[in-house]
């Protein structure tokens, strides 16, 4: 039961995280005009990964896309790439994890396959989350650098009579959405990886406890160990008895008696 819960929760957390990464990537408020030096501005500037916007005194907001690829800063391109990679990996991870969910039955898919898919999606979510966090952090670092550069310019370039206020930019809402979303995706991925350990058919005989009740019908073979012991050389859980006893896979197909692992 705990495995299913962990896997399901990991999936939901990752889903929310990836939705957040997509939202952050599409948002226009990656950087917003710093109003500290000019709190009375009637023209408010903010920028995203794909376009920059200006909200004017009429309440009208005009946005213009960056219609150039080569003319954009390399850092911005890198952030775009990281966010897109994060979204793509996350989307693939979601697709894989849907089929890996223990509560969803697809044909006669073995638990080992589900475990592998859970691990794969978990790793994808972790990388996706890291990409988003990295992308947002790179952009934030870029903002901090530019902020202090423009602050320096503001106080050194004031030789003339005309007062001009240089626009400085600070962290926009998208950065916080991106950090939180990346973190959630990362956590979801870790949860999926943890769930994978519980799903994987372990190479111990703890499942043999299911044979306690059928002790009377067990036929012993020379040199064999009693199936109910769970110890000894039978590490592969091979069938060492006759008389209607079931294989590991057959046992596993029954209602989840061992979900507590």
């Amino acid at each position: 039961m705990a495995v299913t819960a962990c896997q399901g929760l990991g999936f939901v957390v990752s889903l929310i995280g990836i939705a957040g990464i997509i939202a952050a990537t599409c948002m226009d408020q990656w950087s917003t005009q710093d109003l500290y030096n000019n709190p009375v501005t009637a023209v408010f500037n903010y920028q995203g990964l794909w376009r920059s916007c200006v909200r004017e005194s009429s309440g009208f907001t005009e946005c213009r896309g960056y219609f150039t690829l080569l003319g954009l800063p390399a850092m911005l391109q890198a952030v775009r790439a990281l966010m897109i990679v994060g979204i793509v990996l996350g989307a693939i991870g979601l697709l894989v994890s849907i089929f890996a969910l223990k509560c969803i039955r697809i044909g006669s898919m073995e638990d080992s396959a589900k475990a592998n898919m859970t691990l794969t999606s978990g790793i994808m979510f972790i990388v996706s989350g890291l990409c988003a966090i990295a992308g947002v952090s790179v952009f934030a670092n870029m903002l901090v650098t530019n902020f202090w550069m423009s602050t320096a310019n503001m106080y050194t370039g004031m030789g003339g009579m005309v007062q001009t206020v240089q626009t400085r930019y600070t962290f926009g809402a998208a950065l916080f959405v991106g950090w939180v979303a990346g973190g959630l995706t990362l956590i979801g991925g870790v949860m999926m990886c943890i769930a994978c350990r519980g799903l994987a058919p372990e190479e111990t005989n703890y499942k043999a406890v299911s044979y306690h009740a059928s002790g009377h019908s067990v036929a012993y073979k020379p040199g064999g160990f009693k199936a109910s012991t769970g110890f000894g050389s039978n590490t592969k859980n091979k069938k060492i008895y006759d008389g209607g006893a079931r294989t590991e896979d057959e046992v596993q197909s029954y209602p989840s008696k061992h979900d507590y692992v």
Epitope: V40, N45, E56
Partner: antibody
Framework: QVQLQQSGPQLVRPGASVKISCKAS????????MHWVKQRPGQGLEWIGL????????RLNQKFKDKATLTVDKSSSTAYMRLSSPTSEDSAVYYC????????WGQGTLVTVSS | DIQMIQSPSSLTVTAGEKVTMSCKSS????????????LTWYQQKPGQPPKLLIY???TRESGVPDRFTGSGSGTDFTLTISSVQTEDLAVYYC?????????FGAGTKLEIK
């Protein structure tokens, strides 16, 4: 096209508050902020303040902070300006203006403060 | 507050003449976000509300005759009427649309001989 219809002229006693209305039509009322402008007879234009009809957030010129109160009624697409404790200095034509670049202006409301 | 200084305060010209009026702001009205100057020109005829002529310092509003031209950047702006018509008799105001409180110049009164 943008149309702003203002209430008629008002004669008020000093100290008695007055409320001017401005009904908007021809555009989405909540899209653009509503500005109010004062013009004393034979004088220039003076910006009073603005209100965002979508959330009723206001920004007032400090000079009119204790004088003007801006409100909106979204259901009727109407903006209001209330002038408190008017004096002869408040006798003027008051305009509401909206849309991008204040493209649309009301016809003006003449407020006369007289005892 | 940004001060808007208009000159001259009044002009008397004959129809067909070219007219230039100036507007200076105490601070730059150039927005670095989109490289636009947030200065607007209005025309107010007697007994009427102001009418938008020019925005972004040089962009003519649709329907405004092309004899009206706005120019300038930063703090110095100009409105030019290439060939004055009798219907241009009005007061012309420049407005700071960049910083609160939005401020208007005192106006330039255009009179026709």
């Amino acid at each position: 096209q943008v149309q702003l219809q203002q209430s008629g002229p008002q004669l008020v006693r000093p100290g008695a508050s007055v409320k001017i209305s401005c009904k908007a039509s021809g555009y989405s009322f909540t899209t653009y902020w509503m500005h109010w402008v004062k013009q004393r007879p034979g004088q220039g234009l003076e910006w009073i303040g603005l209100i965002d009809p979508s959330d009723s957030e206001t920004r007032l010129n400090q000079k009119f902070k204790d004088k003007a109160t801006l409100t909106v009624d979204k259901s009727s697409s109407t903006a209001y300006m209330r002038l408190s404790s008017p004096t002869s200095e408040d006798s003027a034509v008051y305009y509401c203006a909206s849309n991008r670049w204040l493209l649309g202006w009301g016809q003006g409301t003449l407020v006369t403060v007289s005892s | 507050d940004i001060q808007m200084i208009q000159s001259p305060s009044s002009l008397t010209v004959t129809a067909g003449e070219k007219v230039t009026m100036s507007c200076k702001s105490s601070q730059s009205l150039l927005n670095s976000g989109n490289q636009k100057n947030y200065l607007t020109w209005y025309q107010q005829k007697p007994g009427q509300p102001p009418k938008l002529l020019i925005y972004w310092a040089s962009t003519r509003e649709s329907g405004v005759p092309d004899r009206f031209t706005g120019s300038g950047s930063g703090t110095d702006f100009t409105l030019t009427i290439s060939s004055v018509q009798t219907e241009d008799l009005a007061v012309y105001y420049c407005q700071n649309d960049y910083s609160y409180p939005l401020t208007f110049g005192a106006g330039t009164k255009l009179e026709i001989k």
